[in-house]
């Protein structure tokens, strides 16, 4: 029958080559000569020439050693033709299966494998997986079946069997308790992979197991007791640096310290921060300390880590005795800013007020006073009593020195400490208005026609405050009323000036007396230019003449 069962050929055959494998045979060879040929990869197509056939005998030949890891199976076709080249059989499948020899050692996928595990983990914790490959067959034979083992462990602390490896998966696990990063931070395992499921060729690699830090060490104060001296009133002042030691991995959350003031800071005067490099606790003042109130503070500070402890650990506490040092403190005006009402224009030498300061220091210190800033030079201050007296005329209407009726003065108090200290206070004099200004018209120059003249409206201003202002009253004096009229409007804040008789073109003085609600009178001369014109006019030429 024109069929051929699969041919099994071991790889790496020694020959001699060509080697006869099997014979192609057609039963159509009775009475006719048959010629055989083969086609397919390994015969007439790449890899060419691995197999050949004797054309007349049909012997299938192997021309060279085979390599299963290169090609594990060849699929060829056998052909039979008669002398005239005509096919006498359909192409026949020829399967050549290359059987495996253990001709490859296992190979680890890396020379060095790296893994990590937390210190203190329980036995059974998986660390890492290593892999070795073997090109040989692992399905039908054990040639490519790899078994893993640990050959050695360095260091051998706390003992030489800290890890195990799963023989078939290559998973490395912790087998013993006692992994302590602070004692052994890294283990080097020499691992083996052996084919034939452990009975064949062996290869080695290295597995480096890094022991990761867990927060299993508390930070400890060293020293635990501190004494510090701080000047009173200093804010943000560094009081003391507290030093701790921690066996955990530097600069990790398990090492970085967190400080807490547990007691002794009832007034919330202190704060403590962690120095980013040294890990020290920096105790500073949040508020100024007061020697006179409390000259010593005893603080209790506890230290933990940024990371929580992985097991119950005692916390370390430090005691800091802070001695507050007395400082000569400046006198303080009471109140710091004093408002006093005083009538403007009071006589020179008249007392304005007494403005004194208190000294926070316990000793009885003498305080002396002086004026630091008095822009108008209106005041004087007694150095012993703090009595403020008028030495100039206080003028509410002085726009250079008075703002919104207030005149601002800065005073100074100086103690007799060593060295002396000074404090300042602000005296705000609210000036009460008196009727010391009469009404003034605006403008004081007018131009008017001598025929059908337009009435001239003048605004009235008074620097004083109500009730020393409007309504105003107007009166013409010095015979100005012969030619002119002056009337105050209903609101009493403007005066209307009119020409009642013809005057020739010239410039005239009009004598206008205005008085305020408090009858304060002010005489003003209005310069009136009369023009030869009708109605409204802006300017006209002409000589000046008194009227």
């Amino acid at each position: 029958e024109w069929v051929m069962p699969p041919i099994f050929v071991p790889e790496n055959g020694k020959g001699p080559f060509p080697q006869r494998l099997n014979q192609l045979k057609s039963n159509k060879d009775r009475g006719t000569k048959i010629f055989y040929s083969i086609t397919g990869p390994g015969a007439d197509s790449p890899p060419e020439g691995v197999f050949a056939v004797e054309k007349e005998t049909g012997w299938l030949l192997l021309n060279k050693p085979l390599d299963r890891e290169e090609i594990a199976k060849y699929e060829l076709f056998g052909h039979a033709v008669s002398e005239n080249g005509a096919s006498v059989e359909d192409p026949m499948n020829i399967s050549i299966i290359v059987t495996d020899q253990n001709d490859h050692k296992p190979k680890f996928t890396q020379d060095t494998f790296r893994g990590s595990v937390l210190e203190g983990v329980l036995p059974g914790t998986s660390v890492m997986q290593v892999t070795a490959t073997d090109e040989d067959d692992a399905i039908y034979t054990y040639n490519g079946v790899v078994a893993y083992s640990i050959h050695s462990q360095e260091p051998k602390d706390p003992h030489d069997l800290m890890f195990t490896i799963h023989r078939s998966t290559g998973t490395i696990s912790v087998i013993s308790s006692g992994l302590d990063r602070e004692k052994v931070p890294e283990y080097t395992l020499t691992i083996q992979a052996t084919d034939m499921d452990g009975d064949g060729s062996t290869t080695t690699a290295v597995a480096v197991v890094e022991i990761l830090d867990a927060n299993d060490n508390a930070p400890m104060f060293d020293p635990q007791k501190y004494e510090a001296h701080v000047p009173e009133n200093a804010v943000g002042h560094e009081v003391q640096r507290l030093t701790v030691t921690d066996l955990d991995a530097p600069n990790s959350p398990a090492w970085r310290a967190t400080y807490l003031i547990m007691g002794g800071d009832d007034g919330d005067h202190f704060t403590i921060t962690t120095h980013p490099e040294s890990n020290q606790g920096i105790l500073t003042t949040r508020k100024g300390l007061d020697f006179e109130a409390k000259n010593q503070h005893t603080l209790y500070v506890e230290v933990t880590n940024e990371a929580p402890f992985v097991l119950k650990l005692p916390t370390s506490t430090a005691t800091i005795v802070v001695h507050v040092e007395d400082v000569n403190e400046a006198p303080v005006f009471v109140p710091p800013s004093k408002v006093v009402e005083v009538q403007e224009g009071i006589p020179t030498g008249e007392p304005v007020c007494v403005y004194t300061a208190e000294d926070p220091d316990k000793e009885n210190q003498k305080i002396s006073y002086r004026i630091l800033r008095d822009p108008a030079g209106w005041l004087a201050m007694d150095p012993d009593s703090g009595q403020v007296t008028a030495v100039g005329t206080l003028d509410r209407e002085d726009e250079q020195f008075v703002r919104n009726n207030i005149y601002e003065v800065m005073v100074l108090a100086m103690d007799n400490g060593s060295p002396p200290t000074t404090g300042t206070g602000t005296l705000l004099l609210t000036l009460i208005d008196v009727n010391d200004h009469g009404p003034v018209p605006e403008p004081r120059q007018i131009t008017i026609c001598n025929q059908s003249p337009v009435r001239q409206v003048l605004n009235i201003t008074d620097k004083d405050l109500s009730p020393h202002t409007s309504p105003f009253q107007a009166q013409l004096t010095d015979d100005s009323d012969i030619y002119w009229t002056a009337e105050v409007n209903e609101e009493g804040d403007t005066v209307v000036l009119s020409l009642k008789k013809f005057l020739k073109q010239d410039t005239y003085d009009v004598h206008l007396s205005l008085s305020d609600h408090g009858n304060k009178e002010q005489l003003t001369v209005i310069r009136a230019t009369v023009c030869d014109c009708h109605g409204h006019v802006e300017t006209c030429p002409g000589p000046w003449k008194g009227g």
Epitope: F17, P18, K33, F35, S37, E48, G49, A52, V53, E54, K55, E56, W59, L61, N63, K64, P65, V81, S82, E83, G85
Partner: antibody, heavy 121, light 107 residues
Framework: VQLVEESGPELVKPGASVKISCKAS????????MNWVKQRPGKGLEWIGR????????KYNGKFKGKATLTADKSSSTAYMQLSSLTSEDSAVYFC??????????????WGQGTSVTVSS | ELVMTQSPASLSASVGETVTITCRAS??????LAWYQQKQGKSPQLLVY???TLAEGVPSRFSGSGSGTQFSLKINSLQPEDFGTYYC?????????FGAGTKLEIK
């Protein structure tokens, strides 16, 4: 075993064709491969192709495909090679050489005396 | 295609001397290498096949060796009739390829 290339020296014009013969005797002609080899004056040997007279199977060097055509006549135990579209590059001595069939891995053990072909106008 | 590199290209030796010619294949041809001798105006003659098997009638002073890609032909005690050109040939895969030849001359 004897291989006789019966055609004497050939002088042919460019573009023409020539057919060289090789008569075998002293062995089973049908059961061995017949190879053809080219040798240009003063140069080395170059394999053209081969034919198995039994069933007419041929194998060519890619360089000579379309240039050489191999045939065999079993009745006269003669192998032929026709060269077409000749150019001066085809001027050479052409040898026939037997190769026994053992998966065709035997070397060429008997050679003809060679036929000289000169291409010239 | 396979490239066969022969060395030396030419060689001068005296009768009675021993000479060695080498041949390198560009790929593995196992033991499928033949050596031929060709004299001026004659056809090539097979000396060795399968790298070390002497062809019928070839004197035993000729010997072939090698496998894979490196091969050599050694001629002990050179005789006057041994002078000519020697070729190596791959008889593993087609196209069969020859070396460029080594010309052996009398010194």
């Amino acid at each position: 075993v004897q291989l006789v290339e019966e055609s004497g020296p050939e002088l042919v014009k460019p573009g023409a064709s020539v057919k060289i013969s090789c008569k075998a005797s002293g062995y089973a002609f049908s059961s061995s491969w017949m190879n053809w080899v080219k040798q240009r004056p003063g140069k080395g040997l170059e394999w053209i192709g081969r034919i198995y007279p039994g069933d007419g199977e041929t194998k060519y060097n890619g360089k000579f495909k379309g240039k050489a055509t191999l045939t065999a006549d079993k009745s006269s135990s003669t192998a032929y090679m026709q060269l077409s579209s000749l150019t001066s590059e085809d001027s050479a001595v052409y040898f026939c050489a037997r190769q026994r069939d053992y998966g065709a891995l035997y070397a060429m053990d008997y050679w003809g005396q060679g036929t000289s072909v000169t291409v010239s106008s | 295609e396979l490239v066969m590199t022969q060395s030396p290209a030419s060689l001068s030796a005296s009768v009675g001397e021993t000479v060695t010619i080498t041949c390198r294949a560009s790929d593995d041809i196992y033991s499928y290498l033949a050596w031929y001798q060709q004299k001026q105006g004659k056809s090539p003659q097979l000396l060795v096949y399968n790298a070390k098997t002497l062809a019928e009638g070839v004197p035993s002073r000729f010997s072939g060796s090698g496998s894979g890609t490196q091969f050599s032909l050694k001629i002990n005690s050179l005789q006057p009739e041994d002078f000519g050109t020697y070729y190596c040939q791959n008889h593993y895969v087609t196209p069969f390829t020859f070396g460029a030849g080594t010309k052996l001359e009398i010194k």
